[in-house]
């Protein structure tokens, strides 16, 4: 036969801990029920009565089994350079991530605090390393025999076309121009694009309190703007 289940509130056996979804109330010296996600403790337990829980109000949440007196405030609305990848509900905080064409320059525990536009490589420079959700594009000068004539965060340096007779030699920012006779072959018939990073999030990402509402959340120091890398242009 299974052991008799104690109903909350109850005094725990010496040396034992309260069960899952319960907490030890120091005042009552009893194991008491926690409130489920989406709720908070409206009335704390006593020796004779269990915790009374109430639903979180609009724009507030609790994501864990808890006994907090007030629900946490959801984070502020996402800025124009962000997309809301998780809505504020009674059980989860809002999560904002960067929209396509931007990357997260200053992250927080979940989502992004500050988004920045992906660097664009100017003519004569191509993408050496594409941008990601959390890192900027890295540009590099086009090597001899290659060029880029665009201002782009995705275009790489492309080989010059090879001419039978060269009218104008190519350089880092311009393709070779052939005389009216067609080139023997065109190494680069069109612009080569690198895929844009897409701001996504893990399907299971859990929300967290904003620093202002959670005393133990680590704070990130604000970072000043960094100068653009050589061959890049800020937009």
């Amino acid at each position: 036969l299974p052991a008799q289940v104690a109903f909350t509130p109850y005094a725990p056996e010496p040396g034992s801990t309260c069960r899952l979804r319960e907490y030890y109330d120091q005042t009552a010296q009893m194991c008491c029920s926690k409130c489920s996600p989406g709720q908070h403790a409206k009335v704390f337990c006593t020796k004779t009565s269990d915790t009374v829980c109430d639903s979180c109000e609009d724009s507030t949440y609790t994501q864990l089994w808890n006994w907090v007196p007030e629900c946490l405030s959801c984070g502020s609305r996402c800025s124009s350079d962000q997309v809301e990848t998780q809505a504020c509900t009674r059980e989860q905080n809002r999560i904002c991530t960067c929209r396509p064409g931007w990357y997260c320059a200053l992250s927080k525990q979940e989502g992004c605090r500050l988004c920045a536009p992906l660097r664009k490589c100017r003519p004569g420079f191509g993408v050496a390393r594409p941008g990601t959700e959390t890192s900027d594009v890295v540009c590099k000068p086009c090597a001899p025999g290659t060029f880029s004539n665009t201002t782009s965060s995705t275009d790489i340096c492309r080989p010059h076309q090879i001419c039978n007779v060269v009218a104008i030699p190519g350089n880092a920012s311009m393709d070779a121009v052939c005389t009216s006779t067609s080139p023997t072959r065109s190494m680069a018939p069109g612009a080569v694009h690198l895929p844009q990073p897409v701001s996504t999030r893990s399907q299971h990402t859990q929300p967290t309190p904003e620093p202002s509402t959670a005393p133990s959340t680590s704070f990130l120091l604000p970072m000043g703007p960094s100068p653009p890398a050589e061959g890049s242009t800020g937009d």
């Epitope: 069960r19 899952l20 979804r21 864990l64 859990q206 309190p209």
Partner: antibody, heavy 119, light 107 residues
Framework: QVQLLESGGGLVQPGGSLRLSCAAS????????MTWVRQAPGKGLEWVSA????????FYADSVKGRFTISRDNSKNTLYLQMNSLRAEDTAVYYC????????????WGQGTLVTVSS | DIQMTQSPSSLSASVGDRVTITCQAS??????LNWYQQKPGKAPKLLIY???TLETGVPSRFSGSGSGTDFTFTISSLQPEDIATYYC?????????FGQGTKVEIK
């Protein structure tokens, strides 16, 4: 994105010790309970130990009680499992997992680290 | 300790088939039951929690039901990517216990 990365596994002799680490990122580590689950080669999942968000409460399976110690360093976002007096039957892949709601719902898992106890 | 008995231990089904796995607890655990999927060489993945709630991002062909001691996990239309071992886990009380697993294969 949430990431859990275990390390510290390896080959150890019976009676020896090993300390496993689990580096957490992408979430507020100090607000979540954490757990260790192991899986012996070709076998099922076995819960090993759990720890509350602050580290104040710890729980153990009978099979490891008195030999294993779970702990956490919230300043380093790291979970630990100190394993002493190791036995052959402790050979397993050890996973750390996050308890998503503080109610033994393991919503994120690491990739695991293999511990082999053999002479 | 709460024992979790899962059945069958393995099954073979065709693509498109309905697959059902059962899990029985040795005592009442209310709806505190989770289901996980584990593919070979990978970590387990949470599919269903609180007996019937689908985890975010999990395909709707997976479902769960039950309360008390008897629980059921269903794949409504088996897909090739569903080849894995499935585990139930009680989250009612410590020590946490898992079922022994059900290995699902394609015929």
């Amino acid at each position: 994105q949430v990431q859990l990365l275990e390390s510290g596994g390896g080959l150890v002799q019976p009676g020896g010790s090993l300390r496993l680490s689990c580096a957490a990122s992408g979430f507020t580590f100090n607000t979540y309970a954490m757990t260790w689950v192991r899986q012996a080669p070709g076998k099922g999942l076995e819960w090993v130990s759990a720890i509350s968000d602050s580290g104040g409460d710890t729980f153990y399976a009978d099979s490891v009680k008195g030999r294993f110690t779970i702990s956490r360093d919230n300043s380093k976002n790291t979970l630990y499992l100190q394993m002493n007096s190791l036995r052959a039957e402790d050979t397993a892949v050890y996973y750390c997992a996050r308890d998503g709601t503080y109610a033994a719902r393991f919503d994120y898992w690491g990739q695991g680290t293999l511990v082999t106890v053999s002479s | 300790d709460i024992q979790m008995t899962q059945s069958p231990s393995s099954l073979s089904a065709s693509v498109g088939d309905r697959v059902t796995i059962t899990c029985q607890a040795s005592q009442d655990i209310s709806n505190y039951l989770n289901w996980y999927q584990q593919k070979p060489g990978k970590a387990p993945k949470l599919l269903i929690y609180d007996a019937s709630t689908l985890e975010t991002g999990v395909p709707s062909r997976f479902s769960g039901s039950g309360s008390g001691t008897d629980f059921t996990f269903t794949i409504s239309s088996l897909q090739p990517e569903d080849i894995a071992t499935y585990y139930c886990q009680q989250s009612d009380s410590f020590p946490i216990t898992f079922g022994q697993g059900t290995k699902v294969e394609i015929k």
